[in-house]
C-alpha cells in the first residue's frame, strides 16, 4: 500500500494572485514508492531511497527530491594548461643513432643540455613549465618536442595562455635566428637552423563554466546562468540571492519551476501580497495599496 | 657515470713542450666528443681545442694552431693534447672536458663532463 505521508501547508499566493497551498510533497505529480524494509519513501526526479532519505540527483533536493536548488556546484580545474608542438633544428650536434633510444646516455644528455637551453629561452614567461622532446630525427638534430605552458583558472584563462603561446613563438623564433653556427662552430650553448623552427599545433585547456553549468542543471538549463564572485564561478539560479540575476521576491518566496523562477507571495494576518515580484500589499481590514 | 682524471701539467720555460693526457672511463659508445678548455687567472674558461672519437671533427683555437695538436687514443680511451712553442699567454689551468654527443659548440656550458685540471706555467 502506499504510505500517507503528513502534508504540511503554508499559505502562499502566486504571482497571477490566486492562493495557493504549498505541501512539502508534490500531490499533484505521479510518485513511485520504493519499500525498504519497514521504511518507505517517494523519491521523485531520478532520486533514490538509502534506506534513511531520499538521496536526490543535481539539480533537485528536499524530502522527496521535489525541490530545485538554487545554485549548483561547479568546480573549474585549479589550474589551466596548453601544450604547444615545436620542431627545431639543432646544428651544434651531428645527429648518432643512439638519440633514438631514449634510455641512452646519449639521450640523457641532450636532452638535459636542450631543456637547459629552452629554461634560458623562455625565462621571462610566468605560464612557463617545461619541455617534452617527442621524438630526434637526423637533420642535424631535428628536435619535435612540446612546450608546456600553465596557469591558475581565471574568466580570462584563455586570453593569457593564447598570450604566452605568441611570446613562445616571438622567443623560440629570436633564439633559433640569433645562436647560429660561425665558421661552422657554435659559440652558445646550442645553436640552431633558422629555417628549422615550426610550430605544428597548439592544444589548451576546454573548460567552460557555462557549459557545466548548463548540463547539470538539466531541463532547467535555460534558468541557470553563471556569475563570478573573486574570480571564482558560480552556477545560480535567478532563486540564489546575491548576485546580479537575483530575484527580489519582496514579500514572497522564489520557487523554481519549468518554466523559470516565480514569486510565491505569502498573506499574512493583516496583508496579502501580489504583483510579479509580491511587492504590491494589500491590507486585509481597508483594501487599499501600500507600495 | 663519466669521469676524466688529467695529467702532465707543469712549468716550462717559453719555447718548450709539454704534453697533457686525459684518461675518460664511463662511456658507453666509443663515439663521443673530447675537448681542452684553459683558464688563466682573472679570465674566463676558453676552449684550447676539440676532438670526436671517431675522427669526424677535430678544432683549433687561433691562438694555438700550428703549436698545440689534439689527439685520442680509441684503445686507452685517453685523450692528449701536444703543446709546443709555449708561450707566456699559454699560463692557464687546463682542463679536459667531454661529452656523450659529437659536439661543435666551443661554449663550456654545452660540456657536461670535466676534470679537476692540470696547472701549465710557461715562465723564465
Known amino acids: 500500500p502506499l504510505a500517507t505521508i503528513p502534508v504540511s501547508t503554508t499559505s502562499l499566493t502566486s504571482s497571477e494572485g490566486s492562493t495557493i497551498s504549498t505541501p512539502s510533497v508534490d500531490i499533484s505529480t505521479p510518485v513511485t514508492t520504493s519499500i525498504v524494509g519497514d521504511q518507505c519513501s517517494r523519491c521523485k526526479n531520478g532520486g533514490f531511497w538509502d534506506g534513511l532519505k531520499c538521496q536526490c540527483l543535481t539539480p533537485y533536493y528536499g524530502e522527496s527530491c521535489e525541490e530545485v536548488v538554487n545554485s549548483i556546484d561547479i568546480a573549474p580545474p585549479e589550474t589551466v594548461s596548453a601544450q604547444m608542438e615545436l620542431t627545431v633544428t639543432v646544428t651544434s650536434v651531428k645527429f648518432t643513432d643512439e638519440l633514438k633510444n631514449h634510455s641512452s646516455q646519449e639521450f640523457r644528455e641532450f636532452n638535459k643540455t636542450f631543456t637547459e637551453q629552452m629554461n634560458i629561452v623562455y625565462s621571462g614567461i610566468p605560464e612557463y613549465v617545461g619541455v617534452n622532446i617527442t621524438n630526434l630525427r637526423l637533420g642535424s638534430v631535428v628536435v619535435e618536442h612540446d612546450v608546456l605552458l600553465r596557469t591558475k583558472y581565471t574568466p580570462e584563462y584563455k586570453t593569457a595562455l593564447d598570450n604566452a603561446t605568441e611570446v613562445v613563438k616571438q622567443k623560440i623564433t629570436k633564439v633559433t635566428t640569433e645562436q647560429i653556427m660561425t665558421n661552422d662552430n657554435c659559440s652558445a650553448l646550442m645553436c640552431f637552423n633558422t629555417t628549422g623552427t615550426q610550430v605544428q599545433n597548439i592544444t589548451v585547456t576546454q573548460y567552460d563554466p557555462v557549459e557545466e553549468c548548463r548540463q547539470k542543471a538539466e531541463e532547467y538549463e535555460d534558468y541557470f546562468l553563471v556569475e563570478y564572485r573573486d574570480q571564482k564561478p558560480y552556477c545560480i539560479s535567478p532563486c540564489e540571492s546575491g548576485f546580479n540575476a537575483s530575484k527580489n521576491c519582496n514579500h514572497g518566496k522564489c520557487q523554481m519551476s519549468q518554466n523559470g523562477a516565480r514569486c510565491l507571495c505569502v498573506t499574512t494576518e493583516t496583508h496579502w501580497y501580489s504583483g510579479e515580484d509580491c511587492n504590491q500589499g494589500t491590507q486585509k481590514s481597508h483594501h487599499h495599496h501600500h507600495h | 657515470e663519466v669521469q676524466l682524471v688529467e695529467s702532465g701539467g707543469g712549468v716550462v720555460q717559453p719555447g718548450g713542450s709539454l704534453r697533457l693526457s686525459c684518461a675518460a672511463s664511463?662511456?658507453?659508445?666509443?663515439?663521443?666528443?673530447m675537448a681542452w678548455f684553459r683558464q688563466a687567472p682573472g679570465k674566463e674558461r676558453e676552449v684550447v681545442a676539440f676532438?670526436?672519437?671517431?675522427?669526424?671533427?677535430?678544432y683549433y683555437a687561433d691562438s694555438v694552431k700550428g703549436r698545440f695538436t689534439i689527439s685520442h687514443d680509441n684503445s686507452k680511451n685517453t685523450l692528449y693534447l701536444q703543446m709546443n712553442s709555449l708561450r707566456a699567454e699559454d699560463t692557464a689551468v687546463y682542463y679536459c672536458?667531454?661529452?656523450?654527443?659529437?659536439?661543435?659548440?666551443?661554449?663550456?656550458?654545452?660540456?657536461?663532463?670535466w676534470g679537476q685540471g692540470t696547472m701549465v706555467t710557461v715562465s723564465s
Open positions: 664511463g662511456y658507453t659508445s666509443n663515439r663521443y666528443s
Open positions: 672536458a667531454a661529452s656523450s654527443l659529437l659536439l661543435q659548440t666551443i661554449n663550456p656550458r654545452a660540456w657536461p663532463y
Open positions: 676532438i670526436w672519437t671517431d675522427g669526424g671533427r677535430t
